[in-house]
């Protein structure tokens, strides 16, 4: 009598996560009688996947009707495959007994699971940085298999080269994660810039996944300050203008000081955007020259995005103007927002 053979024709099978995997196994004889069992892995720690005779295995169904006469096909179908199902599966013939005795194993079929990477998540620096500084962006994607993966960084469509990428774990695993860091040198024009992390994987069929971050979250463009005096008005009032230009973000507080004393404080709000994404703001102060004996030192103090205040001062020459008794030092708040 010929010795029983357990035939697993495929050395390996690759399946997309969520699909069903078919693991083929046939035996060469009905004799000796006894169950076929499927295991993942070999040795004492192997995991029982299916036993036709005993137990319930809701995810596993036999491919052929095992109750059919002369059935020698013990192939199984495992539904809803996840990366955790990866491994080598063995079809094992047992001789009926109390307990059943292992007789022969198939050569094994390695099941690999193709799992899509998760959508890349890009995170930027915790604090804003100014132009000419370098900031780091990180991109993370998880749960993919096989391990081979490509990750690229782009800034405004141009590929970045200052990149460090790691795929973990280094050894064999059911699924993998990728983490990449890109270093970007900021320019004043980057308010509207965007970095893109692009992940390509065999499971994506040439349609890479992208994660984005806006540099507007990472950049601070400090303002330029300019204080100027308009020509004297007929009522002896001088209009002094503080022009705050090309700043980002909008969070800005402006304080006028007259001879070191706070005259007025304003907060920027609802400013129109420049083409490059920055903002401008103009504030003015009316100074009644006739109310002062001495020259008036006006200071425009700007606190931008929580940074130390920046000052710009201007002296109004009182000696050049005739004096009037009893007039107010400063006019009402007539500051306006200008582009």
């Amino acid at each position: 009598e010929e010795e029983l053979q357990v035939i697993q024709p495929e050395k390996s099978v690759s399946v997309a996560a969520g699909d069903s995997a078919t693991l083929n196994c046939t035996v060469s004889s009905l004799i000796p009688v006894g169950p076929i069992q499927w295991f993942r892995g070999a040795g004492p720690g192997r995991e029982l996947i299916y036993n036709l005779k005993e137990g319930h295995f809701p995810r596993v169904t036999p491919v052929s009707d095992p109750t059919k006469r002369n059935n020698m096909d013990f192939s199984i179908r495992i539904s809803n495959i996840t990366p955790a199902d990866a491994g080598t599966y063995y079809c094992v013939k047992f001789r009926k007994g109390s307990p059943d005795v292992e007789l022969k194993s198939g050569a094994g079929t390695e099941l690999s699971v193709r799992a899509k990477p998760s959508a890349p998540v890009v995170s930027g620096p915790a604090v804003r940085a100014t132009a000419e500084h370098t900031v780091s962006f990180t991109c993370e994607s998880h749960g993919f298999s096989p391990r081979d993966i490509t990750l690229k960084w782009f800034k405004n469509g141009n590929e970045l080269s200052d990149v460090q990428t790691n795929v973990d774990p280094a050894g064999k695993s059911v699924s993998y994660s990728i983490r990449s860091t890109a270093r970007v040198v900021l320019t004043r024009r980057d308010v509207h810039s965007q970095v893109i992390c692009e992940v390509a994987h065999v499971t994506l069929q040439g349609d890479p996944l992208r994660g984005t971050a806006n540099l507007s979250e990472a950049i601070r463009v400090p303002p330029f300050l300019e204080v100027t005096q308009q020509s004297m008005r007929a009522d002896n009032q001088v209009n002094v203008t503080c022009q705050v230009t090309k700043f980002y973000p909008q969070r800005l507080q402006l304080t006028w000081l007259e001879n070191g004393n706070v005259s007025r404080t304003e907060m920027a709000s609802a400013l129109p955007e420049n083409k490059d994404g920055t903002y401008n703001w103009t504030s003015w102060l009316l100074v009644n020259v006739s109310a002062h004996r001495d020259d008036v030192k006006l200071t425009c103090q700007v606190e931008h995005d929580g940074q130390p205040a920046v000052n710009k001062s201007f002296s109004v020459k009182v000696s050049a103007h005739p004096k009037e008794q009893g007039s107010n030092t400063a006019a009402e708040n007539t500051g306006t927002n200008e582009r």
């Epitope: 004799i31 009688v33 109750t67 059919k68």
Partner: antibody
Framework: EVKLEESGGGLMQPGGSMKLSCVAS????????MNWVRQSPEKGLEWVAE??????????HYAESVKGRFTISRDDSKSSVYLQMNNLRAEDTGIYYC????????????WGQGTTLTVSS | DIVLTQSPASLAVSLGQRATISCRAS??????????MYWYQQKPGQPPKLLIY???NLESGVPARFSGSGSGTDFTLNIHPVEEEDAATYYC?????????FGGGTKLEIK
């Protein structure tokens, strides 16, 4: 340990009805075909009925002598198989065995101890 | 239906000798190279116990002194050497087709 325990036998009059029960333990009942076989001095061992698995749509088969009178059924949740016997005849007298079919081929590897049915007026 | 005829109806064999029981089917019980014949032993007050499956294969836990052979329509159960505990009635049964049928039995007595 595989165990099959029959119950429900007794003395019945011809034309009467009776239901035999068999409770199984020690194995995954729902994965096995189950059978009833009876034995009498006159007829020897006689296969009566078979019920297959849920995956076989609980297909049933009967000996010609009981067809239309006997009904085999199973309740996998209770690991039980039943034999409903109607219109009983004297020749239905015997020991009724509940049997597990190991390999879907009338491979009768485990038998219960049997329950006795006597049909007599 | 396939009729199974067993012979002899009874036999007496000396301890240590060979007992041979025959079972003839009215129609072949062989398909696809397999012989769908089974042998059982029954002692008084007990249910039958499976000895041999598919004509020639020893059921788990059955002593090796029991053996089966045959194909098609003619099958044989051999017991050698016979022991005292082998005194029983032996039945053949087929599963070649529905309905499954049993032979009439052979009563073995040990001398």
């Amino acid at each position: 340990e595989v165990k099959l325990e029959e119950s429900g036998g007794g003395l019945m009059q011809p034309g009467g009805s009776m239901k035999l029960s068999c409770v199984a333990s020690g194995f995954t009942f729902s994965n096995y075909w189950m059978n009833w076989v009876r034995q009498s001095p006159e007829k020897g061992l006689e296969w009566v009925a078979e019920i297959r698995l849920k995956s076989n749509n609980y297909a049933t088969h009967y000996a010609e002598s009981v067809k239309g009178r006997f009904t085999i059924s199973r309740d996998d949740s209770k690991s039980s198989v039943y034999l409903q016997m109607n219109n009983l005849r004297a020749e239905d007298t015997g020991i009724y065995y509940c049997i597990r079919d190991y390999d879907y081929d009338a491979y009768f590897d485990y038998w219960g101890q049997g329950t006795t049915l006597t049909v007599s007026s | 239906d396939i009729v199974l005829t067993q012979s002899p109806a009874s036999l007496a064999v000396s301890l240590g000798q060979r007992a041979t029981i025959s079972c003839r089917a009215s129609k072949s019980v062989s398909t696809s190279g397999y012989n769908y014949m089974y042998w059982y032993q029954q002692k008084p007050g007990q249910p039958p116990k499976l000895l041999i499956y598919l004509a020639s294969n020893l059921e788990s836990g059955v002593p090796a002194r029991f053996s089966g052979s045959g194909s098609g329509t003619d099958f044989t159960l051999n017991i050698h050497p016979v022991e005292e505990e082998d005194a029983a009635t032996y039945y053949c049964q087929h599963s070649g087709e529905l309905p499954y049928t049993f032979g009439g039995g052979t009563k073995l007595e040990i001398k």
